[in-house]
């Protein structure tokens, strides 16, 4: 398994991840956002709500 060198993002990238943690993937020369639960998107900019549908009558 190839090891990936990671560190925190620089101050230059403050605010890059809207709802998540910014990680600097050194070997890939990329900033990466690790999103909080409920958020998605490159910069954790999209909120998604998982709606659990109640069981329909035929399953009751």
């Amino acid at each position: 398994v190839a090891q990936v060198s990671i560190t925190k993002c620089s101050s230059d990238m403050n605010g890059y991840c809207l709802h998540g943690q910014c990680i600097y993937l050194v070997d890939m020369s990329q900033n990466y956002c690790r999103c909080e639960v409920g958020y998605t998107g490159v910069r954790c900019e999209h909120f998604f709500l998982t709606v659990h549908q109640p069981l329909s009558k035929e399953y009751v």
Epitope: S11, D12, Y24, R43
Partner: antibody, heavy 116, light 106 residues
């Protein structure tokens, strides 16, 4: 593949304004920051400022504050840099640079000549 | 603003020589420094980022080191195609370029 295509060369008179465009293809500018860098003939590289196209936030180098305006139109995936009150020392190649999802990725540059 | 002092501003060396360029930051930049090569009429080319990480396709004769405020860029064996101007860039807090080093062949 990913590209930043800048507008063509401009010749302006002292005191005028110039607006340089930077159109992205192959990626969404909302996923990045767009930086602007300039280089006067025979001189070094100078960072001017940047925009966060997703939120519209801008940061400028102090010496350009009040004279430069960086904007972005996410519907056309294009960033802009407008410099006003031009003087001869503003003659330079202006570059847009993507950062964020890729460390640095440069446009081809736009030559702006300020001459009376 | 963070200032980046790059030295020397120019140097002349023979093919095969070891070439060293330094950049000193006005404050700790936490290893967030990149090195660029620029040839006349071309956009800068990224060689190294995060102090020492070589970009894909960049020859191993190029290297970088340092920490805190002091950083070094080295060409272990100068080649004719290395004739260019080299710039450091800090990206810890916004961005600042060093003044550049013009490398020529003796």
């Amino acid at each position: 593949q990913d590209q930043l295509v800048q507008s063509g060369a401009e010749v302006k008179k002292p005191g005028a304004s110039v607006k340089v465009s930077c159109k992205a293809s192959g990626f969404n500018i909302k996923d990045t920051y767009i930086q602007w860098v300039r280089q006067a003939p025979g001189q070094g590289l100078e960072w001017m400022g940047r925009i966060d196209p997703l939120r519209g936030n801008t940061k400028y180098r102090e010496k350009f504050e009040g004279r430069v305006t960086i904007t972005a139109d996410t519907s056309t995936n294009t960033a802009y840099m407008e410099l006003s009150s031009l003087r001869s020392e503003d003659t330079a190649v202006y570059y847009c640079v993507r950062s964020g999802t890729l460390f640095d990725f440069w446009g081809q540059g736009t030559l702006v000549t300020v001459s009376s | 603003d963070i200032q980046m002092t790059q030295s020397p501003s120019s140097l002349s060396a023979s093919v095969g020589d070891r070439v060293t360029i330094t950049c000193k930051a006005s404050q700790d930049i936490h290893k967030y420094i990149a090195w660029y090569q620029q040839k006349p009429g071309q956009a800068p080319r990224l060689l190294i980022q995060y102090t020492s990480t070589l970009q894909p396709g960049v020859p191993s004769r190029f290297s970088g080191s340092g920490s805190g405020t002091d950083y070094t860029f080295t060409i272990s064996s100068l080649q004719p195609e290395d004739i260019a101007t080299y710039y450091c860039l800090q990206y810890d807090n916004l961005r600042t370029f060093g003044g550049g080093t013009k490398v020529e062949i003796k």
